[in-house]
Interface confidence: low
């Protein structure tokens, strides 16, 4: 089992009504300008103050936009994605992925023990070394007999 539980991905549908200054956010990404390595997805780079997205409050910088009005944003050039948002109409439905990080979270630990948690190898290595030393001493002692 992977011992890390340090981030959480949520997806939700966000319905925005276009305001005087548009949807109120900027995007980065696309097949021609990857924002995340090995990911050509479209990400929110900036939420404009008092814009439609900011007033709604759910969309956040760093969110990945998966679809606009049901249209998938996979494998789009950046400008094509921009055009899609511009032509999306007055009421816009966004499928958005939020990634929440545990801030400076350590490697997970088991149960209700000490929150610092002791990595298993820190226990196993000394035990193994002690076992080897004991075995060596025993063999040598036997030979002397």
């Amino acid at each position: 089992m992977n011992g890390r539980v340090d981030y959480l991905v949520t997806e939700e549908e966000i319905n925005l009504t276009r305001g005087p200054s548009g949807l109120g956010f900027n995007i980065v990404g696309g097949t021609d300008q990857q924002y995340v390595s090995n990911d050509s997805g479209i990400y929110v780079s900036r939420i404009k103050e008092n814009g439609a997205a900011a007033l709604d409050g759910r969309l956040q910088e760093g969110d990945k936009i998966l679809s606009v009005n049901g249209q998938d944003l996979k494998n789009l050039l950046h400008q094509d994605a921009v055009d899609l948002f511009r032509n999306a109409g007055y009421a816009v439905s966004l499928r958005v992925q939020h990634r929440l990080q545990v801030q400076n979270g350590p490697i997970g630990h088991r149960g209700e023990g000490d929150p610092s948690g002791i990595p298993i190898f820190m226990v196993l290595v000394p035990v193994f070394a002690l076992t080897m030393v004991a075995a060596w001493a025993f063999m040598r002692y036997r030979q002397q007999l």
Epitope: N2, R4, V5, D6, V9, T10, E11, G111
Partner: nanobody, 120 residues
Framework: EVQLVESGGGLVQAGGSLRLSCAAS????????MGWYRQAPGKQRELVTA???????NYADSVKGRFTISRDNAENTMYLQMNSLKPEDTAVYYC???????????????RGQGTQVTVS
């Protein structure tokens, strides 16, 4: 459809304690990762803590030593014991569930409606 229902929020004085509960319907609770995250008005969402089916836990630095996550697989319930509460802990707390031990992928209907915690 999986449903998550949080309870236990409320108004508490700084230094006080609260215990949040998250009841999950559905039969896949046993193999799920469960987590709590929170959002205060005008602030970014923050993942507070998560726990795997095997009991491995993780905490944000801001709550470490004060909050304890636990789960009762038999009862399909997860808990968040919050001690030494501070005004900055004020937020809506959501529970969420997923099916991976490395992260939680949560569809919108796999997240609760939240419970308000206010620390004065």
């Amino acid at each position: 459809e999986v449903q998550l229902v949080e309870s236990g929020g409320g108004l508490v004085q700084a230094g006080g304690s609260l215990r949040l509960s998250c009841a999950a319907s559905g039969s896949i609770f046993r193999i799920d990762v469960m987590g709590w995250y929170r959002q205060a008005p005008g602030k970014q969402r923050e993942l507070v803590t998560a726990i795997t089916s095997g009991g491995i836990t993780n905490y944000a630095d801001s709550v470490k030593g004060r909050f304890t996550i636990s789960r009762d697989n038999a009862e399909n319930t997860m808990y968040l014991q919050m001690n030494s509460l501070k005004p900055e802990d004020t937020a809506v707390y959501y529970c969420a569930k997923g099916i991976s031990d490395s992260y939680l992928r949560v569809e919108s209907n796999y997240r609760g409606q939240g419970t308000q915690v206010t620390v004065s």
